[in-house]
Structures are given as C-alpha cells and as structure tokens.
C-alpha cells in the first residue's frame, strides 16, 4: 500500500496544533495528518503518543479501574500511570485486575515480604527458609501485611 492510497477524512474537531513531519515522522504527542504533510497534536487527557511516529491516530489514554489509584494523569506524550490500591497487587500473569493481598502467612511460616502494588506478601518456612507457593492457606496466623509505596505503571493500553 502506498502512502498516497490513504484518503483520510477528519470530522470537525477542536483546533489542534500542527507542525511539519521530520522525514515522514511526527514527534511524541502528535500523529500524522490526513495528507502526511502535518503533525497534529494528540488531545490532552484523551490520547497520546510516546515516540516519533507515523500513526494515523494517537493512542487512547488508559483509564484506571476501580480498585486502582491514578499516580499520574495522561498527557499528550505519556499514558496514565495506575497503581493498585493499598492491600491489593497486580500479578504479571494476570495484569487485568488487582487482587487482594493475603493478610497473613500459613502456620509454620513467617512473613519476609510486605504486600506491594505488584506483589503479594512473601512467606517462607520458619525452619528451611523456602518460599510458600502462594495459594491461600486454610489457616492463617495473625501476621498482617503493610502495603508498599513505590509506583507500578499500569501496563494496559486501555
């Protein structure tokens, strides 16, 4: 498909800043125009682009889900940063949702790591020091976790 094959049509929208592409690419915070001659700014708080690009459209800003807090808002050059609320965490293998951290370790285990926005509490066997596999125990001790504070950017695009 040649560049000329695309015939864009843009409905009336609020006036957006334009600049010229450099070697066919537009800077972060912009997308390429209808005819490829202009760079059009993304809409603040609505969409964004992070790199030099030849995108027809800016990417939609992520909206933090319930159960998440917004650490930093979406700008034209950076997506929203979302983090799980205190007492919850997001696992790498299920990034769609925040899960509740366990409140304590199973009997015979001791807590060595707190609940953070990206990890559950960490438990090890008192004697051997081996880690607990992570399934919710039938009986828990009263060791409680304290939430961590560092930021974890939201990995989802929407």
């Amino acid at each position: 498909i040649t560049q000329q094959d695309l015939a864009p049509q843009q409905r009336a929208a609020p006036q957006q800043k334009r600049s010229s592409p450099s070697e066919g690419l537009c800077p972060p915070g912009h997308h390429i125009s209808e005819d490829g001659r202009d760079c059009i700014s993304c809409k603040y708080g609505q969409d964004y682009s992070t790199h030099w690009n030849d995108l027809l459209f800016c990417l939609r800003c992520t909206r933090c889900d319930s159960g998440e807090v917004e650490l930093s808002p979406c700008t034209t050059t950076r997506n929203t940063v979302c983090q799980c609320e205190e007492g919850t965490f997001r696992e790498e293998d299920s990034p769609e949702m925040c899960r509740k951290c366990r409140t304590g370790c199973p009997r015979g285990m001791v807590k060595v790591g707190d609940c953070t926005p990206w990890s559950d509490i960490e438990c090890v066997h008192k004697e051997s020091g081996t880690k607990h596999s992570g399934e919710v125990p039938a009986v828990e001790e009263t060791v409680t976790s304290s939430p961590g504070t560092p930021a974890s950017p939201c990995s989802l695009s929407g």
């Epitope: 498909i1 843009q10 490829g36 690009n53 027809l56 459209f57 939609r60 695009s157």
Partner: nanobody
Framework: EVQLLESGGGEVQPGGSLRLSCAAS????????MGWFRQAPGKDREFVSA????????YYAESVKGRFTISRDNAKNTLYLQMSSLRAEDTAVYYC?????????????????WGQGTLVTV
C-alpha cells in the same frame, strides 16, 4: 484477549450494496482503533479503511473513497463497513482488525487482533 467475528458478506451484483459487521467479544474494543482490510484471491492483504477509538477520524484507501463508509458503535462493541457501488474488483475476503493504532500505509501498531474474515463476491 479480544475476539472479532465478521458477518454480512455474500454475493451481490455490480453496483449493489452490502453492510459488513464486526462483533467484538472478550475485552472491550472501545480503547482500540479499528479497521477493515481485504484480500483478493492471489493478492496480498490490503488496507481498506480505519477509524480511531473515538470514531471521529476516519481513513479510506483511495480505491474505496466515496463508496465505503466505516463506523463503530462502542456501546455494542461493533464495527461496520457500509459498501455501495460495488465493483468486481471489490471481491475479496474482508477482515476486521483492532489495534492500538494504525500506521500510515495501514499497518497495525501495538497490540492487534484479527477476525477470521467474511467473503464478499461481486
């Protein structure tokens, strides 16, 4: 994970009209730009049309401009392609795609998902 299912294809006389639909299931596609592509027998897949996540900016290949109209209903998680003044050269399998964006030239950018296609014969 997003699943896309096209429908509405079929046989039509030259000059006739068809409306293709693409129903999305799984994760909502309201965050994604969406597009239509087509592949004629013995040819490469080509870009037809795309629109942004909000549905307010559309692009068309020159070959379909003025004849095809792309639209979306985010509430129904559905993409449409209204095709009119159809020609023999429009005969192809039409595919729906959802992507974070599309590059100039039509290539999908970022996460992207594809349907299985629906055959249009003119």
């Amino acid at each position: 994970e997003v699943q896309l299912l096209e429908s509405g294809g079929g046989e039509v006389q030259p000059g006739g009209s068809l409306r293709l639909s693409c129903a999305a299931s799984g994760r909502t596609v309201s965050n994604y730009a969406m597009g239509w592509f087509r592949q004629a027998p013995g040819k490469d897949r080509e870009f037809v049309s795309a629109l942004n996540w909000g549905g307010d900016t559309t692009y068309y290949a020159e070959s379909v401009k003025g004849r095809f109209t792309i639209s979306r209903d985010n509430a129904k998680n559905t993409l449409y392609l209204q095709m009119s003044s159809l020609r023999a050269e429009d005969t192809a399998v039409y595919y729906c795609a959802a992507a974070q964006s599309f590059r100039r030239g039509g290539a999908p950018y970022g996460d992207n998902y594809w349907g299985q296609g629906t055959l249009v014969t003119v």
